[in-house]
Structures are given as C-alpha cells and as structure tokens.
C-alpha cells in the first residue's frame, strides 16, 4: 500500500478521502483508525454508522467526523480543529466480520497556522469574492509518499 | 489518453510457466480492477482474473485457479499474469483490460484493453 | 458462475438494414444496489474487443447512435438500426454484477 500525505493547518479542518469501490466493498462498514507505531495496531478512532444503509449519516467521536458515500465509493473523514498530536499514520478500512482491509493509508501532517506568528509583511488578505473562513476550511492537501520516504522518523 | 501497452509475444514448452505484463498510462493505476482475459484461435472470450491494485486484491475463475498469478507493480503501474504448467490449449492470445473501480456515471466494464500478447505452448 | 447466452452465434446483414443481437443470463444480472452490470463489446477483425454499450443501454462515449441496447434482469437485446460495412465483427455480451465475469460465445455478423 502507497500512503498518501493530507496536509491541514492548525486550528482548521482537515478532509481526507479514501476512495474504494463499492461494487467490492458492498454492504461493508468502514472505519478510520490510527497506527501506533511502525508495526504497531491500528487504534479505531471511529467508524461508520451500525446499520451500513445509514452510512451516509456523520458519525463524531470527538473532533473526528466520518461520512460514507456507499454508492460513489468515497469514504470521507473530517478532522475539525487540527492540532499538532493529530499528526501521524493512519488508515481507511473496510470491515467485514473481524477482519479489516486497508482502503488508504494516510499520512496526516499539521502545518502551523501562518496567522500565528506572522510578520505584518506577510499578511494575506483573500479577494473580495471569497470569504476568510471559505478560503480555509476543509483545506487539505495531498501527495503519494515517495519511495524511498518514511512514515515514521526514527526515534533517537 | 489511457493506455495499456501488453509484452510481446512468446513462444513456450508444455509444463514451462509464461508472464504477461501490461504496462498502464494515462489514469489512476491504484483505483481500477485490472482484468486478464484470453481468447484462443478462432474462439470467444475467457475472462481469467483481475487484481486491484490499490490493494493487491485479486479473483480468479475456477478454472485457471492455482495456476495463474495476476500481480500488480504500483510504482511502475505495470500489471502482470504468470500462466503456469503450460499446455497447448493454453496456446492464446492474452489482454488486459482496465475496468474502473464502481462509481456513479462510471462503467463498470472493461473500457480500455491492452492490444493482446499471443503465447504459443508447443513442443 | 453466471453463464451468459447468446443468439444468433452468425448474422449476415445487407448494409442499411436493423439488426438484433439477444443475450441471455442464468440469473438475474441485477446487482443489490440497483444497476444492471451487463455490457456488449464488439471485435472487430484483427483488433482487441472495445466497449460499445454499457449497463444495459449506455452508449460509450464515441460509438455511433445507431446502436442501442435494452432489457433487463435476464434478458437482454443490442440493436443495430442501420447496419453499415465498418460494424462487421464478433459482438459479445458480458457482465461484471458477479465474479467470476463472463461472457457469450459470441455473435458474428457479416455483411450480405
């Protein structure tokens, strides 16, 4: 599996999607859950709602949303507020009995927020067409990891 | 443009194994099932495998299980089947062809074909 | 896995004249999310198969509007309206609703 990097600010919202396709994954709950460590499990944060016709349904647990798009093939995680620990490796699954397949797995990388410590040179202002709060939320960027890249940086 | 651009042909023993690649262009390699399918002289179409390269996934028709591999190599976006315990019937001309990964407004059918790699099986 | 029927196996059309193709499938080709996965390819002498018509009546981006397909659960048509000298070839019928994917023997149509 490629990882894919998501780059969000913090203090903003972030959206990652995992596509799949849903003739495969029909019927299938998802879910979105960290990894811990390298080798380590991955941690469930959330997942869809229990009844998969209701998976169009947005499910919190806490600052982390998921949304199903069962038919489109697209599932979708929204982490509100983005935070620095937020940082790290996780995963889109697909869950059928016990067993999890991996969808995508993700890299979530917290830019800080340039507003935070600004030179007054360096202040943006959006054009007039667009509000300030429409030109930040749900911004994310995303890349493929490339070869030779590591998820995790060695610990010293 | 999509395109899927299949190996030469090859020439091959009874009991000896064959691989086929299909190098793929133009679309997103990872979220597409790609499909192998075989057509012997004069003969109609025999759909073989697919593997989901997002995942490795893969199915195979009863009849080619345990001795076809389909494989599929990300970073070059190369598909590949290994054929083996090579027999003359198995003497055809082998596709791949792309079918994109279910989404509305999509097909759901083998919409881009490779132009075909004939395997001969003699002694 | 589901066995795909086709009728006529030959056809032999004079140019400007309809022609009719059936498939029929062992079981119903309608999957639990409500689309029908049943396709027809046309292959063309010398040439690798190409999509024509897909889930049961979409014509593929670039293929003429003298073809069109219908039906539905396990019975299935592709029309040609007015046949003409480049749509000479074997057309199959397939469907993708289950794995294993497969298709009809074929029908071969010729021009008179």
């Known amino acids: 599996h490629n990882t894919t990097v998501f780059q969000g600010v913090a203090g903003q919202s972030l959206q990652v999607s995992c596509p799949y396709d849903s003739m495969k994954h029909w019927g299938r709950r998802k879910a979105w859950c960290r990894q811990l460590g390298e080798k380590g499990p991955c941690q469930r944060v959330v997942s869809t709602h229990n009844l998969w016709l209701l998976s169009f349904l947005r499910r919190w647990n806490g600052s982390t949303a998921i949304t199903d798009d069962t038919l489109g093939g697209t599932l979708t995680i929204t982490l509100r507020n983005l935070q620095p620990h937020d940082a790290g490796l996780y995963q889109c699954q697909s869950l059928h009995g016990s067993e999890a397949d991996t969808l995508r797995k993700v890299l979530v990388e917290v830019l800080a927020d340039p507003l935070d410590h600004r030179d007054a040179g360096d202040l943006w202002f959006p054009g007039e067409s667009e509000s300030f709060e429409d030109a930040h939320v749900e911004h994310s960027i995303s890349r493929s990891l490339l070869e030779g890249e590591i998820p995790f940086p060695p610990t010293s | 443009q999509v395109q899927l651009v299949q190996s030469g042909a090859e020439v091959k023993k009874p009991g000896s194994s064959v691989k086929v690649s299909c190098k793929a262009s133009?679309?997103?390699?990872?979220?597409?099932?790609m499909n192998w399918v075989r057509q012997a002289p004069g003969q109609g179409l025999e759909w073989m495998g697919r593997?989901?390269?997002?995942?490795?996934?893969?199915n195979y028709a009863q009849k080619f299980r345990g001795r076809v591999t389909i494989t599929a190599d990300e970073s070059t976006s190369t598909a590949y089947m290994e054929l083996s315990s090579l027999r003359s019937e198995d003497t055809a001309v082998y596709y791949c062809?792309?079918?994109?990964?279910?989404?509305?407004?999509?097909?759901?059918?083998?919409?881009?074909w490779g132009q075909g790699t004939l395997v001969t099986v003699s002694s | 896995g589901v066995v795909m029927t086709q009728t006529p196996l030959s056809l032999s059309v004079t140019p400007g004249q309809p022609a009719s193709i059936s498939c029929r499938s062992s079981?119903?080709?309608?999957?639990?999310?409500?689309?029908?996965?049943l396709h027809w390819y046309l292959q063309k002498p010398g040439q690798s198969p190409q999509l024509l018509i897909y889930k049961v009546s979409n014509r593929r981006s670039g293929v003429p509007d003298r073809f069109s397909g219908s039906g539905s659960g396990t019975d299935f048509t592709l029309k040609i309206s007015r046949v003409e000298a480049e749509d000479v070839g074997v057309y199959y019928c397939s469907q993708s609703t289950r794995v294993p994917y497969t298709f009809g023997q074929g029908t071969k149509l010729e021009i008179k």
């Open positions: 079981q119903s080709l309608i999957h639990s999310n409500g689309y029908t996965y």
């Open positions: 593997i989901y390269p997002g995942d490795g996934d893969t």
């Open positions: 062809a792309r079918l994109l990964r279910n989404q509305p407004g999509e097909s759901y059918a083998m919409d881009y």
């Open positions: 133009g679309y997103a390699f990872s979220l597409s099932w």
